[in-house]
Interface confidence: low
């Protein structure tokens, strides 16, 4: 990941965290952790679509995208989009939806994030080739079974000792501002409004920001281009790594990187990627969760906005523009039309939505066929040419036919999987995003 992407990741996470609705009284500020980033990068290099079984007490979010680059904003959007399926008061995820990526992103006690991305000519567990895999690890891990991601209340009213309030987040006294140095895109302080999820799908091309986190920004990753490891950005937005892993791949922390993979794979925790079916010409990305490993399956894939992406890519959720940073390779972040315009089939994941499990076995591997990469394509509102593949445990999602498909990996956490992954892959670009 570039420095900008790292900062963006952290900033987006923090923006999302600061803007949770209902507001959080104990939300900690996230910061980048190089050790976590190195750990995430090392795993990403293995090119496995599934959660790291050796992640120990680390949360994990995965995101994968075909094309030449990672799309951090898109990944965040995908992860954060699951918010629409999560009920905080009941601590449940809507049936058939994923919420784990989202819950990891807004897990109050998680304060360190590290992400890494790697370009994989072949991603184990995925038929698609040339995929940029984003892995984000978190500490302390989120998605603890039986626990809510955060305590509702006045922002900062329950900050731990030694923390002060800043932008509605509890920040360690004397700590540097993590997002302060974001190059190019300095996300504005979260508005602390409940609108964080409402607009998450509509993402502009600007680099991913946490507040209105772009809907599934997917950066295109050229098949032959090895993408840089995505540093774990201290964003509080869930890292909805698109990955289709076999069961047990889900990690608790949502990955922070999104690549512009033509197709996006959504893990079971990508519940609401394309809540509204959307079709994109040429390709759409639908999260194809392969397995949900120890993660709340409630992650949803944020929609990407087609307007602001240059590179082709696909996104699962409604039309949204991609944010600048996340769309590195997703040059065709084309703005996506309203999610309603995206055609997406939803296939129930094998995991029961809302069901909390310490671990989730992804019994159904994504059966999606390899999605062709479509260079020069970008997520588009109407995917006329894209085909949709129904993947087990995948969430519905659509990307512009020109956009790479995106799949969010399962979000695995020490806790449980919230819900099955629903989704289908719209063929052209693939984006794997999922929580395992």
């Amino acid at each position: 990941l570039t420095d900008e992407e790292k900062r963006l990741m952290v900033e987006l996470h923090n923006l999302y965290r600061a803007q949770v609705s209902p507001t959080a009284s104990d939300m900690l500020h996230m910061r980048w952790d190089e050790e976590l980033a190195a750990f995430a990068k090392a795993y990403a290099r293995q090119c496995v679509w599934g959660h790291n079984k050796e992640r120990g007490r680390r949360g994990e979010n995965l995101f994968a995208i075909t094309d030449e680059g990672m799309d951090v904003p898109l990944a965040m959007e995908e992860w954060h989009h699951e918010r629409e399926h999560y009920n905080l008061s009941a601590a449940t995820c809507s049936p058939g939806q994923m919420c784990g990526h989202y819950t990891q992103v807004v897990w109050a006690k998680t304060e360190r994030i590290g992400c890494g991305s790697h370009f994989c000519e072949k991603l184990q567990g995925v038929e698609e080739t040339n995929i940029e895999l984003l892995v984000c690890n978190y500490e302390p891990p989120g998605n603890v079974k039986g626990k809510r991601p955060y305590q509702e209340g006045t922002p900062c009213s329950q900050c731990p000792s030694g923390y002060h309030c800043k932008n509605s987040l509890c920040e360690p006294i004397g700590s540097p501002e993590d997002a302060q140095d974001l190059p190019y895109l300095v996300t504005e302080a979260p508005s602390f409004r409940a609108t964080e999820a409402s607009d998450s799908r509509k993402m502009g091309t600007p680099s991913s920001l946490a507040t209105g986190i772009p809907a599934f920004l997917v950066t295109e990753v050229s098949g032959s281009l090895a993408t840089k490891a995505l540093p774990a950005v201290e964003t509080q937005a869930p890292t909805s790594l698109a990955t289709k892993d076999p069961p047990s791949m889900a990690t608790e922390a949502p990955p922070c990187v999104t690549t512009e993979v033509p197709s996006i794979l959504a893990a079971h925790s990508l519940p609401s990627l394309d809540e509204e079916p959307v079709t994109f010409p040429k390709s759409t990305h639908v999260p194809i969760p392969k397995s949900a490993d120890k993660v709340t399956d409630k992650t949803k894939v944020p929609s990407r906005s087609p307007e602001n992406s240059l590179d082709p890519k696909m996104s699962l959720t409604g039309a949204r523009e991609l944010l600048p940073h996340a769309q590195e390779e997703a040059e065709a972040e084309a703005e996506l039309p309203p999610s309603s315009e995206v055609l997406a089939s939803v296939f129930p994941a094998q995991d029961k939505p809302g069901e909390l499990q310490a671990t989730l076995d992804h019994t159904g591997h994504t059966s999606s066929k390899s999605l062709p990469n479509f260079p020069n394509t970008s997520a588009t509102a109407n995917a006329t040419g894209g085909r949709a593949l129904a993947l087990q445990s995948s969430l519905p999602g659509a990307e512009g036919p020109d956009k790479p498909s995106v799949v969010s990996g399962l979000n695995s956490g020490p806790g449980h999987v919230w819900g099955p992954l629903l989704g289908l892959l719209l063929l052209p670009p693939l984006v794997l995003a999922g929580i395992f």
Epitope: D71, E220, S224, P281, S305, P306, N308, L310, L322, P375
Partner: antibody
């Protein structure tokens, strides 16, 4: 410090060709998408083309499609714009700009100083 | 593909607040786009200022003063660049732009020349 320096501009006759270069420094060139944006003196900005960090994806404005080719040599940290079948309306200052990531997203930041291309008989 | 329309000029006194609009053509919703804003002073290349998609999805360019902020006017289907506390050095041309993924092209607005009185 990120620096972008365009070169190769000049006077060319209609129907002629010209190749612009943009030497980049101060950042990992291959990690970023790069673009060309032009501006007719005294007029507005017009996006011309973008290429992803790895060079696998290229995008062009309809006005130049089929005539212009964008490429990059990541080993030389250089961006190129091959302009063929030039027309008078292609006369403009051509800027190269860095994107925020490897994907083309239209996040032009920063920009080079530009190089003037004049197409005239 | 969408068209971004900007007023050709805008004059305001130093210290005033300026609201520049970038109207999206009919058939497109500004909420679906990431509107970026660029500033260009005479003789200089453009400078990236910020982008805006929603209140929760926006960002400033590096070193861009907080006096510059973005927003959307849904009723007008336009992106907004607000410059508060206008200063003489803000006199420049301002361009909005956005990427249109359907056509895979980047679109610039026609630009607004801001004059500080």
């Amino acid at each position: 410090e990120v620096l972008l320096l365009e070169s190769g501009g000049g006077l060319v006759h209609p129907g002629g060709s010209l190749k612009l270069s943009c030497a980049a420094s101060g950042f990992t060139f291959s990690s970023y998408a790069m673009s060309w944006v032009r501006q007719v003196p005294g007029k507005g900005l017009e996006w011309v083309s973008t290429i992803s960090g790895g060079g696998g994806y290229t995008y062009f404005a309809d006005s130049v499609k089929g005539r212009f080719t964008i490429s990059r040599d990541n080993s030389k940290d250089t961006l190129y714009l091959q302009m063929n079948s030039l027309r008078a309306e292609d006369t403009a200052v051509y800027f190269c700009a860095k994107d925020l990531g490897s994907r083309a997203q239209g996040w032009f930041d920063p920009w080079g100083q530009g190089t003037l291309v004049t197409v005239s008989s | 593909q969408p068209v971004l329309t900007q007023p050709s000029s805008h004059s305001a006194s130093s210290g005033a607040s300026v609201r520049l609009t970038c109207m999206l053509s009919s058939g497109f919703s500004v909420g679906d786009f990431w509107i970026r804003w660029y500033q260009q002073k005479p003789g200089n290349p453009p400078r990236y200022l910020l982008y805006y998609h929603s209140d929760s999805n926006k960002g400033q360019g590096s070193g861009v003063p907080s006096r510059f902020s973005g927003s959307n006017d849904a009723s007008a289907n336009a992106g907004i660049l607000r410059i508060s506390g206008l200063q003489p050095e803000d006199e420049a041309d301002y361009y909005c732009g956005t990427w249109h993924s359907n056509s895979k092209t980047f679109i610039f607005g026609s630009g607004t020349k801001v004059t500080v009185l």
